[in-house]
């Protein structure tokens, strides 16, 4: 089990101001650490680039929703 107390924390200090096409997104993770000044979502793109986004924005929520559905649907 990882040491949560000493594990390094990733925080976002600025958010992208561009909407990213869902076709370019591979995965996401939520940043809700009490060590971070802002709640955030980090999207990983299909070329492995990480982008900080504002979870309050509708396109961000829609993108997470889309990725969740992709995860739930088994690839045949």
């Amino acid at each position: 089990q990882p040491d949560a107390i000493n594990a390094p924390v990733t925080c976002c200090y600025n958010f992208t101001n561009r909407k990213i096409s869902v076709q370019r997104l591979a995965s996401y993770r939520r940043i809700t650490s009490s060590k971070c000044p802002k709640e955030a979502v980090i999207f990983k793109t299909i070329v492995a680039k990480e982008i900080c986004a504002d979870p309050k924005q509708k396109w961000v929520q829609d993108s997470m929703d889309h990725l969740d559905k992709q995860t739930q649907t088994p690839k045949t």
């Epitope: 949560a4 107390i5 939520r30 809700t32 009490s34 060590k35 000044p37 997470m64 929703d65 559905k69």
Partner: antibody, heavy 121, light 111 residues
Framework: QEQLVESGGDLVKPEGSLTLTCTAS?????????MCWVRQAPGKGLELIAC???????TYYASWAEGRFTISKTSSTTVTLQMTSLTVADTATYFC??????????????WGPGTLVTVSS | AYDMTQTPASVEVGVGGTVTIKCQAS???????LSWYQQKPGQPPKLLIY???TLASGVSSRFKGSGSGTQFTLTISGVESADSATYYC????????????FGGGTEVVVK
């Protein structure tokens, strides 16, 4: 062992004010957690009021609590909840709760026993 | 908004039986952002499960959490009389929206 204890619950008149205190022992706020206040009206469910980062002091509120309730870290072991313009609907047991670690998604593994706030004329 | 709704409000189960409690989120919260609590009268809630399916320390393996997206389930198997309590789900997806972060609760009565 790790413990939270709430204090300050009282009988207060409508439109009155009250400050609740949550005192931690067995751990320090220098280890980052979300410290939150949760209330439960008699016979009702759990309602989150506000949370504060124990390390950097970032705060979040339920929309209905904004402006009337203020969460603060007052020392390395205490968190307070200031409540103003109280109404009968604020009558509840108020719990202090701490997340399992610094992340919001791991749930509250430490709770105080609660303190009763009664608003009545 | 991430409003949590629980069903049923109350359920009766015999000792040794199985009970299933459902929790629905008003929008997707992913597959690892849900916690479950047990609360007995006069006591604070007790964390049972976090991360949708991870048992909290000291919790019996009779409790099982599952689900993803908007639909989540708590299953209690081999029910014991000590399981009589109210159970709550809680979203762990966002701290920015605290309104209705807890479900309304499900009272489990063991006969």
């Amino acid at each position: 062992q790790e413990q939270l204890v709430e204090s300050g619950g009282d009988l207060v008149k409508p439109e009155g004010s009250l400050t609740l205190t949550c005192t931690a022992s067995g751990f320090s706020f220098s280890t980052s957690y979300w410290m939150c206040w949760v209330r439960q009206a008699p016979g009702k469910g759990l309602e989150l009021i506000a949370c504060i980062s124990s390390s950097i002091g970032v705060t979040y509120y339920a929309s209905w609590a904004e402006g009337r309730f203020t969460i603060s870290k007052t020392s390395s072991t205490t968190v307070t909840l200031q409540m103003t313009s109280l109404t009968v609907a604020d009558t509840a047991t108020y719990f202090c709760a701490r997340t399992t670690d610094d992340n919001w998604n791991v749930g509250f593994n430490l709770w105080g026993p609660g303190t009763l706030v009664t608003v009545s004329s | 908004a991430y409003d949590m709704t629980q069903t049923p409000a109350s359920v009766e189960v015999g000792v040794g039986g199985t009970v299933t409690i459902k929790c629905q989120a008003s929008q997707s919260i992913g597959n690892r952002y849900l916690s479950w609590y047990q609360q007995k009268p006069g006591q604070p809630p007790k964390l049972l499960i976090y991360g949708t399916s991870t048992l909290a320390s000291g919790v019996s393996s009779r409790f099982k959490g599952s689900g993803s997206g908007t639909q989540f389930t708590l299953t209690i198997s081999g029910v014991e009389s000590a399981d009589s309590a109210t159970y709550y789900c809680q979203q762990g997806a966002t701290i920015s929206y605290l309104d209705n972060a807890f479900g309304g609760g499900t009272e489990v009565v063991v006969k």
